[in-house]
């Protein structure tokens, strides 16, 4: 019998202090650059080694960023999202959605992380 992959979705508030070279990560996404089908959200595509995000350790590649300093990132053009990050100041608060892949049992068993549940 085949196993099935589900996702456990969690949210976290991450406070970063801007480093000498900025926030230390790259983003993809936006209404004009969809990274995930039918989702114009903003995602982390790369964490810079020894940058602010890497040194903090909580932000991961693939995370979805829901808000910056309380400002929602829904329905933004990619460049508008970039500008929001770049102008966010020295102390930056990120609301982040992590998707943790979990391997469940045989098909038919609904696991804890099943998004359809």
């Amino acid at each position: 019998m085949n196993g099935r992959v589900d996702y456990l979705v969690t949210e976290e508030e991450i406070n970063l202090t801007r480093g000498p070279s900025g926030l230390g990560f790259n983003i993809v996404g936006g209404t004009d650059q969809q990274y995930v089908s039918n989702d114009s959200g903003i995602y982390v595509s790369r964490i810079k080694e020894n940058g602010a995000a890497a040194l903090d350790g909580r932000l991961q590649e693939g995370d979805k960023i829901l808000s910056v300093n309380g400002q929602d990132l829904k329905n933004l053009l990619h460049q508008d999202a970039v500008d929001l990050f770049r102008n966010a100041g020295y102390a930056v608060s990120l609301r982040v959605q992590h998707r943790l892949q979990v391997q469940n049992g045989p098909i038919g068993h609904r696991g804890e992380g099943d998004p359809s549940g």
């Epitope: 480093g19 070279s21 900025g22 990560f25 790259n26 993809v28 650059q33 982390v44 595509s45 460049q79």
Partner: nanobody
């Protein structure tokens, strides 16, 4: 398998032009920031130019501003570097580089890029 393949290098006279191309495969090109770097013998790899995912935003090293132009074609997965008024000091191996997404930490350091081509030699004689 990610591949960046440069072409268009060669030997030219001072004042001449060259057009370098970089063909990308194995990546979703439209998500990538692309750049050109160069490395002269015995020197470090230096930033030349970068272009954002859509081609709407470019950045150049001071030494090439007004002479070099970076552009991209997302339909063809290519990035080009048009080099005009070439000078002997432009002699170097030119590398194409790419990184997924838009950087919030800078785009002029070679360490900011994940994928690299093998390079193409540009030699400018007096």
């Amino acid at each position: 398998d990610v591949q960046l393949v440069e072409s268009g290098g060669g030997l030219v006279q001072a004042g001449d032009s060259l057009r370098l191309s970089c063909a990308a495969s194995g990546i979703t090109f439209r998500w990538y920031t692309m750049a050109w770097f160069r490395q002269a013998p015995g020197k470090e790899r230096d930033f030349v130019a970068t272009i954002n995912w859509s081609g709407s935003d470019t950045n150049y090293a001071d030494s090439v501003k007004g002479r070099f132009t970076i552009s991209r074609d997302n339909a063809k997965n290519t990035v080009t570097l048009q080099m005009n008024s070439l000078q002997p000091e432009d002699t170097a191996v030119y590398y194409c580089a790419g990184v997924p997404g838009t950087s919030l930490s800078g785009e002029t350091d070679p360490r900011d890029y994940d994928y690299w081509g093998q390079g193409t030699q540009v030699t400018v004689s007096e």
